[in-house]
Interface confidence: low
C-alpha cells in the first residue's frame, strides 16, 4: 500500500514543484521523492521495505499520475542506497537515495531542489510546504494530481512531550503541526520545503494523521549532509 498522504491540503499548481518525484512500485505510486541532483532522487528508506522483487521506478515532471503530460517521464532505478543505519523498526535515518538509470532531462517542470546543508533547526512557526500524491481523507481516497499543504514547524520540546511523540524526536528529526492538515502514509519520502530549500523528508513510520497531538515527523536533511554528499560523489 502507498505510504503517506496529504490531509487538509489542496491541489498544487501544476508543475510549480519541478523537484517533486513519485517513487513507483510495479507502476503504482508508492512514495514521494525529491530530485536533489540530475541523476539522484531522495526519498525514505522504509518505502522500499516491501518492494523486494518489484520493479521500482521514478516518475518526474508529473502533476497528474494518470494523464499524459509533455514533461512526464518514468525513469528506471540504477541503484537504491538506503542509509546504512536505517532499521525497519525505527524512524531514525529514514533516508533513501535512488540513482536514476540516466541523468534526468531538466526543464521548467523537472529541476533539482537545493537542500539544506547547515545543521540548524528551522525556527518554530516557520511555514513549510509539503506535497505528495498520498490519500487525501481518512476514507483512503487517492488523488490523481499532486496535493500540497503549508504546515508550521513545531518546536522539538513540544513534539517530544509524553502526550505527543514522547522523546522520539531527536536532533536529526523535526516536526510540523498536524491539526487537521498533515502529511502521512504515502507522502513518505516527499519534501518539506522551507523558504525554497529542502529541509525535511517525510518519514514513513506508521502514525495517526491529522491529530494535533501526533505531529508530522520529518528527517532533517542537513543532519545527513555528509552521507548525501558521499553517495552523490
Amino acid at each position: 500500500p502507498p505510504r503517506g498522504r496529504i490531509l487538509g491540503g489542496r491541489e498544487a499548481e501544476a508543475h510549480a514543484r519541478p523537484y517533486m518525484a513519485s517513487v513507483q512500485l510495479n507502476g503504482a505510486h508508492l512514495c514521494g521523492g525529491v530530485l536533489v541532483a540530475e541523476q539522484w532522487v531522495l526519498s525514505a528508506a522504509h518505502c522500499l521495505e516491501d518492494a523486494a522483487d518489484g520493479k521500482v521506478q521514478v516518475l518526474l515532471g508529473a502533476h497528474s499520475l494518470s494523464q499524459p503530460e509533455p514533461s512526464k517521464r518514468l525513469y528506471d532505478v540504477l541503484r537504491a542506497v538506503p542509509h546504512p543505519d536505517s532499521q525497519p523498526d525505527t524512524i531514525d535515518h529514514d533516508l533513501l537515495l535512488l540513482q536514476l538509470s540516466e541523468k534526468a532531462t531538466l526543464g521548467p517542470a523537472v529541476r533539482p531542489l537545493p537542500w539544506q546543508r547547515v545543521d540548524r533547526d528551522v525556527a518554530p512557526g516557520t511555514l513549510c510546504d509539503v506535497a505528495g500524491w498520498g490519500i487525501v481523507n481518512h476514507a483512503g481516497r487517492r488523488p490523481d494530481s499532486l496535493q500540497h499543504v503549508l504546515l508550521p514547524v513545531l518546536d522539538r520540546a513540544t513534539c517530544n512531550r509524553r502526550t505527543h511523540h514522547d522523546g522520539a524526536i531527536t536532533e536529526r528529526l523535526m516536526c510540523a503541526e498536524s491539526n487537521r492538515r498533515d502529511s502521512c502514509k504515502g507522502d513518505s519520502g516527499g519534501p518539506l520545503v522551507c523558504g525554497g530549500v529542502l529541509e525535511g523528508v517525510v518519514t514513513s513510520g506508521s502514525r495517526v494523521c491529522g491529530n494535533r497531538k501526533k505531529p508530522g515527523i520529518y528527517t532533517r536533511v542537513a543532519s545527513y549532509a555528509a552521507w548525501i554528499d558521499s553517495v552523490l560523489a
Epitope: I91, G167, S223, A225
Partner: antibody, heavy 122, light 107 residues
C-alpha cells in the same frame, strides 16, 4: 541535576570483549541521544557513535563500526557500549555524553560521564 | 570526515593575560563549532557552541569567534583555574570530530 554514572575501570586481555555502562539520571533519558567518545593520548577525542534511547536507532563513526555496539535499557535509563576484539590500540578512557540542544538544535555534548578507563594488556 | 586542526599543542600564558586558541576546519562548517575545557582528571566541559554562544554558567571572559573554516577561543584575562586542555569540535555533520587539543600552561 543531570548525572551520567559510568562503570569502573577494566583490565582486559587482547582479543577479549568488554561492556561499559552509563546510568543516566536527572533528565528524560529518551529525549536525548547518548554519545560515546574515546580519549587516547595518540588520537585525542574521537566520537564513536550515538544511540537514540527512545528507538534504539544507532549511528556509528565508520572507524568504530566493527569495534563498538551501542545499546540501551530504557527501564533502567542505562546506555551500554560493547567493545570487541580488543587490542592495545583500544586502551583509552571512554566517555558517555548526552547531546545538547540550543533552539532545538544539536550543538555538542553538554553532559559527560566521569569516564571508564579500559586497559588492554596481556 | 571533517578534520579539525589545532595548530598549537601548547600555549604559555600568565595570569591576567589575554590568550587566543585557534582551530581550523578542513571545510566550511558555517559556525557550527563548539569548544570544550578539560582539566586534569576530569571530563570535558562544554564552553561555547555555534562558534560564539556561551554555555550556561561559563564566565564571560571566554569568548568564541570565527566563520567559514577559522575559529578562535579567546580568554580575555586568564585565571589560574583556566589552565587546562581546550578542544574544538565541529557540530556541522557526522561523524562529529574534534581538534587535537591545545594545552594552556602558565609561564
Amino acid at each position: 541535576e543531570v548525572q551520567l554514572q559510568q562503570s569502573g575501570p577494566e583490565l582486559v586481555k587482547p582479543g577479549a570483549s568488554v561492556k561499559i555502562s552509563c546510568k543516566a539520571s536527572g533528565y528524560s533519558f529518551t529525549a536525548y541521544y547518548m554519545n560515546w567518545v574515546k580519549q587516547s593520548p595518540e588520537k585525542s577525542l574521537e566520537w564513536i557513535g550515538d544511540i537514540n534511547p527512545s528507538t534504539g536507532g544507532t549511528t556509528y563513526n565508520q572507524n568504530f563500526k566493527a569495534k563498538a555496539t551501542l545499546t540501551v535499557d530504557k527501564s533502567s535509563s542505562t546506555a551500554y557500549m560493547h567493545l570487541k576484539s580488543l587490542t592495545s590500540e583500544d586502551s583509552a578512557v571512554y566517555y558517555c555524553a548526552t547531546t545538547y540542544y540550543s533552539g532545538n538544535s544539536y550543538v555538542g555534548f553538554a553532559y559527560w560521564g566521569q569516564g571508564t578507563l579500559v586497559t588492554v594488556s596481556a | 570526515d571533517i578534520v579539525m586542526t589545532q595548530s598549537h599543542k601548547f600555549m604559555s600564558t600568565s595570569v591576567g593575560d589575554r590568550v587566543s586558541i585557534t582551530c581550523k576546519a578542513s571545510q566550511d562548517v558555517s559556525t557550527a563549532v563548539a569548544w570544550y575545557q578539560q582539566k586534569p582528571g576530569q571530563s570535558p566541559k562544554l564552553l561555547i557552541f555555534w562558534a560564539s554562544t556561551r554555555h550556561t554558567g561559563v564566565p564571560d571572559r571566554f569568548t568564541g569567534s570565527g566563520s567559514g573554516t577559522d575559529y578562535t577561543l579567546t580568554i580575555s584575562s586568564v585565571q589560574a583555574e583556566d589552565l587546562a586542555l581546550y578542544y574544538c569540535q565541529q557540530h556541522y555533520s557526522t561523524p562529529w570530530t574534534f581538534g587535537g587539543g591545545t594545552k594552556l600552561e602558565i609561564k
